[in-house]
Interface confidence: low
């Protein structure tokens, strides 16, 4: 019968020749004419056999990621007879992986958003690289990711690739960050390869800043002709957070005349002053109301930043109409 | 604002290496991505690669076998080096800064050197 | 690589006309990354427009920036003496980096 142990070729060997093994019958006693014989796809180009010996030689340089495995035919021939030995046998030659292909992140380019403040350990992206070595020769393939870019903020968890928050961020400060990942194959140890990807993580707002008045104190004049119902001036708060966040709703706090009266505008975000009951000079010729201000939707869990409305306080000045 | 200054020998023989440095002024070289690119006279650019300040590279694989491009932080500088070259790789050599601040992603080369000419003859 | 070829080689306009040079790419150019730089002879590259459409700093408006995929325009809306000069498109969206042949406008 035939002999032969499993073969097997490094991919990538630059030397001219590679010895791979022997095929041999064990009607070989070394005394036999016994002729090897090589068939199939790559006999004699990319594989060449000592027909006396049954050695077997690479003569190229394999890619296993093109190919890896080749299926050969093997013969014996008795030259003295001219008939088989053995009967015609198939056998396997393998392409042994060597660590010469990188991780490559192919989904990118990668983008996230998650919301500021998120805890720590929230998930935020998942990245994956593929390596096209061989998953079942040693570690060629297996994978480690690491944060090349993006402490003290993220972290990733080294065999999933999964990006998690490590540090509350907030949008206010900083709206977006560019994480860099690398995936490293054989695990990390010596002769491993690497591949990097970008993440652009924005952050989305919520509603963890208060309205706050730009000024403490405004001083605004009304004339003792002026109607109820005129707007006689307008307040204003700025608020750090963006979109519906920083929608925000004006009130009065304090008016013990109950002479005037605030609505907000929703489009400017501006609180105008209306005049509630006509006003005379001669009767009181200026007003002090305190102002405060809200925002419009704050989640209950959200309601930590919100605690003490910011106020203002607001001089009305009464101007005097010459009365007939 | 922030200047590039490419230098060099003007003059490499045929096979040997050629060896250019880009000088950083006015800023710093952290946090940015650094390239070189070149143009032979009377053509087109050709872009050979880049190093991000902490040392990672990618080169152009047209040339990837010749080059090797590192950075020194310390000296605000990086270097261009290609060996084995010929009169092909005679050209004007740029060095030039990514648009893009803190990125992983190609951007467009905002600053440019003035260009340092390097001629390949014996 | 993906392969930038810039239309026309040679464009000969007088100053106060309209310019449109064209860039087209061998495969879409992701996220629109597409550059285009003007250079003058003895000078480096200066940066236009990035992002196939969004001025650099201190680019006159009558440079514009248009298209995605694999078309990409650069329209220069009203041709000043300063703007005769050779033009490059640059993809960024894949790794090599690559520029086109660049298109010379020159005044007629």
């Known amino acids: 019968g035939w002999v032969w142990n499993q073969f097997f070729v490094p991919e990538e060997m630059n030397t001219t020749s590679h010895h791979i093994g022997q095929l041999r019958s064990d009607l070989d006693n070394g005394n036999n004419s016994f002729q090897y014989k090589l068939l199939g796809a790559g006999a004699g180009s990319t594989f060449i056999i000592d027909e006396r010996t049954g050695d077997i030689y690479a003569i190229q340089k394999l890619d296993r990621e093109e190919r890896s495995l080749y299926i050969l035919r093997a013969q014996v021939i008795d030259i003295a007879t001219g008939r088989a030995v053995e009967p015609e046998s198939e056998f396997v030659i393998k392409v042994s992986d060597i660590n010469d292909n990188e991780p490559k992140f192919l989904d990118e380019p990668y983008e996230a958003i998650v919301p500021e403040m998120s805890p720590e350990g929230t998930l935020v992206i998942q990245v994956t690289a593929s390596d096209a070595d061989d998953p079942s020769s040693g570690n060629n393939a297996r994978l480690l990711y690491s944060l090349l870019q993006g402490q003290p903020y993220f972290s990733v968890e080294p065999t999933t690739g999964v990006i998690r928050i490590s540090s509350k961020m907030d949008r206010e400060l900083q709206d977006e960050y560019w994480v860099i990942i690398q995936a490293k194959d054989m695990i990390g140890q010596p002769g491993a390869l690497s591949g990097t990807t970008s993440v652009l993580i924005k952050l989305s707002d919520v509603n963890d800043n208060k309205p706050i008045f730009k000024e403490s104190l405004y001083r605004l004049t009304v004339s003792e002709s002026a109607p109820t119902g005129t707007s006689i001036g307008t307040i204003m708060a700025y608020d750090n957070d963006i979109g519906e966040n920083a929608e925000m709703d004006y009130s009065i706090e304090e008016d013990d005349s109950q002479t005037f009266d605030i609505i907000t505008n929703h489009e400017t975000q501006e609180g105008i002053v209306i005049l509630k009951k006509k006003v005379d000079f001669e009767h009181q010729n200026h007003y002090g109301i305190r102002a405060k201000v809200k925002n419009h939707h704050v989640p209950e869990q959200l309601m930590k930043y919100h605690t003490e409305a910011s106020t203002t306080f607001i001089k009305i000045q009464v101007e005097d109409v010459d009365e007939p | 604002q922030v200047q590039l200054q490419e230098s060099g020998p003007g003059l490499v023989k045929p096979s040997e290496t050629l060896s250019l440095t880009c000088t950083v002024s006015?800023?710093?070289?952290?946090?940015?991505?650094w390239s070189w690119i070149r143009q032979p006279p009377g053509k087109g650019l050709e872009w050979i690669g880049y190093?991000?300040?902490?040392?990672?590279?990618n080169y152009n694989p047209s040339l990837k076998s010749r080059v090797t491009i590192s950075v020194d932080t310390s000296k605000n500088q990086f270097s261009l080096k290609l060996s084995s070259v010929t009169a092909a790789d005679t050209a004007l050599y740029y060095c030039?800064?990514?648009?893009?601040?803190?990125?992983?992603?190609?951007?467009?080369?905002?600053?440019w050197g003035q260009g340092t000419m390097v001629t390949v003859s014996s | 690589d993906i392969v930038l070829t810039q239309s026309p080689g040679t464009l000969s306009l007088s100053p106060g006309e309209r310019a449109t040079l064209s860039c087209r790419a061998s495969?879409?150019?992701?996220?629109?990354?597409l550059a285009w730089y003007q250079q003058k002879p003895g000078q480096a590259p200066r940066l236009l427009i990035s992002g196939a459409s969004s001025r650099a700093t201190g680019i006159p408006d009558r440079f514009s920036g248009s298209g995605s995929g694999t078309d990409f325009t650069l329209t220069i809306s009203r041709l000043e003496p300063e703007d005769f000069a050779v033009y490059y498109c640059q993809q960024y969206g894949k790794s090599p980096i690559t520029f086109g042949q660049g298109t010379r406008l020159e005044m007629k």
């Open positions: 495969q879409s150019v992701a996220g629109s990354y």
């Open positions: 190093i991000y300040y902490i040392g990672s590279t």
């Open positions: 006015g800023g710093s070289i952290n946090s940015y991505y």
């Open positions: 030039a800064r990514d648009s893009r601040y803190r990125s992983g992603w190609y951007d467009a080369f905002d600053i």
